[in-house]
Interface confidence: low
């Protein structure tokens, strides 16, 4: 036997109190799939969260963060304070990147400069708190009579890269 509730579309719920009639979701609730026996409460974007997309009868509200903050977690479950480039957020607030590290975004962690020597290259441009080092050609490429130097590859250790 077919479940009578399977006929209830998204935006409704199967109301057992009304002989399994499809009732519209009440205000501030939604059902994103058919055949639901209840509607889910809409997410409310409060405080540091702001509404990116209003709740509808078929889809939940979506939040993002107010200026000066950025989203973290699946579906922007948290808002984290922005820092300046060259800083990272610690428990005590925004702190400058330590020497040898950089952060070129307003969020995320300071990350180590690329170690050019691992790729047999030399440092072409020194790193700063805000920027990674730029690796130049390998010393062999600079020897007399070497063919024209190709532009340096963009450089940093891959993985956990600058945001």
């Amino acid at each position: 036997l077919q479940d009578p509730c399977s006929n209830c579309p998204a935006g409704t719920f199967c109301d057992n109190n009304r002989n399994q009639i499809c009732s519209p979701c009440p205000p501030n609730s939604f059902s994103s799939a058919g055949g639901q026996r209840t509607c889910d409460i809409c997410r409310q974007c409060k405080g540091v969260f702001r509404t990116r997309k209003e709740c509808s009868s078929t889809s939940n509200a979506e939040c993002d963060c107010t200026p000066g903050f950025h989203c973290l977690g699946a579906g922007c479950s948290m808002c984290e304070q922005d820092c300046k480039q060259g800083q990272e957020l610690t428990k005590k607030g925004c702190k400058d990147c330590c020497f040898g590290t950089f952060n070129d975004q307003k969020r995320g962690i300071c990350r180590p400069w690329t170690n050019c020597s691992l790729d047999g290259k030399s440092v072409l441009v020194n790193g700063t708190k805000e920027r990674d080092v730029v690796c130049g050609p390998s010393p062999a490429d600079l020897s007399p009579g070497a063919s024209s130097v190709t532009p340096p590859a963009p450089a940093r250790e891959p993985g956990h890269s600058p945001q």
């Epitope: 330590c98 070129d104 995320g108 300071c110 170690n115 891959p158 993985g159 956990h160 600058p162």
Partner: antibody
Framework: QVQLVQSGAEVKKPGASVKVSCKAS????????MHWVRQAPGQRPEWMGW????????KYSQEFQDRVTITRDTSASTAYMELSSLRSEDMAVYYC???????????WGQGTMVTVSS | DIVMTQSPLSLPVTPGEPASISCRSS???????????LDWYLQKPGQSPQLLIF???NRASGVPDRFSGSGSGTDFTLKISRVEAEDVGVYYC????????FGQGTRLEIK
């Protein structure tokens, strides 16, 4: 929701090239680095290269340096990985994966199977 | 490249029991800024890998608290306090201090 959707499976002849696409949705492509990882059947994953978030600069694993090109089309929110001079050892599932704000590959595409056969 | 070595390679576990996977790197993954550049991933059968733990000990969003990561330098451990049937798959450690490399994987199966 945040997701990466990759192009479908490919069958290529040895010596040919393959270009895999990876469409980002639910977030802004230029806010996060994009990496490419491949996995041959029964093997551990192998990192191929990445594209920097802001400026799209790329860096490749030494092993693929001469054969791989990573690009992106920000207007289409899509990243691409092209591998040339294919050989039988390149038969693998190729993944795009986003690097999260504090590191770690937090979102992965579903993978694209590339078969190399004459 | 940094070589990552996992043990055991196969791990049969009874549901509800704890499980532990070891990962050793050929050189220290602890950077002077205090981060261990090591992540843990789970690849369930027929699926893409999923992030469990980043920077050595931080649980990723949505990961149950039965998963925990510990260790520093060259020796790291992933612990599952009570294994559930859905935890079946291959667990990989991955270092990202230098060119990214993965461990060979540990296959967790239910006894």
């Amino acid at each position: 929701q945040v997701q990466l959707v990759q192009s479908g499976a490919e069958v290529k002849k040895p010596g040919a090239s393959v270009k895999v696409s990876c469409k980002a949705s639910g977030y802004t492509l230029t806010n996060y680095p994009m990496h490419w990882v491949r996995q041959a059947p029964g093997q551990r994953p192998e990192w191929m290269g990445w594209s920097n978030a802001g400026n799209g600069n790329t860096k490749y694993s030494q092993e693929f340096q001469d054969r791989v090109t990573i690009t992106r089309d920000t207007s289409a929110s899509t990243a691409y990985m092209e591998l040339s001079s294919l050989r039988s050892e390149d038969m693998a599932v190729y993944y795009c994966t986003r690097e999260g704000v504090t590191g770690g590959f937090d979102i992965w595409g579903q993978g694209t199977m590339v078969t190399v056969s004459s | 490249d940094i070589v990552m070595t996992q043990s055991p390679l196969s791990l049969p576990v009874t549901p509800g029991e704890p499980a532990s996977i070891s990962c050793r790197s050929s050189q220290s993954l602890l950077h002077s800024i205090g981060y261990n550049y090591l992540d843990w991933y789970l690849q369930k059968p027929g699926q893409s890998p999923q992030l469990l733990i980043f920077l050595g000990s931080n649980r990723a969003s949505g990961v149950p608290d039965r998963f925990s990561g510990s260790g520093s330098g060259t020796d790291f451990t992933l612990k599952i306090s009570r294994v559930e049937a859905e935890d079946v798959g291959v667990y990989y450690c991955m270092q990202a201090l230098q060119t990214v490399t993965f461990g060979q994987g540990t296959r967790l199966e239910i006894k």
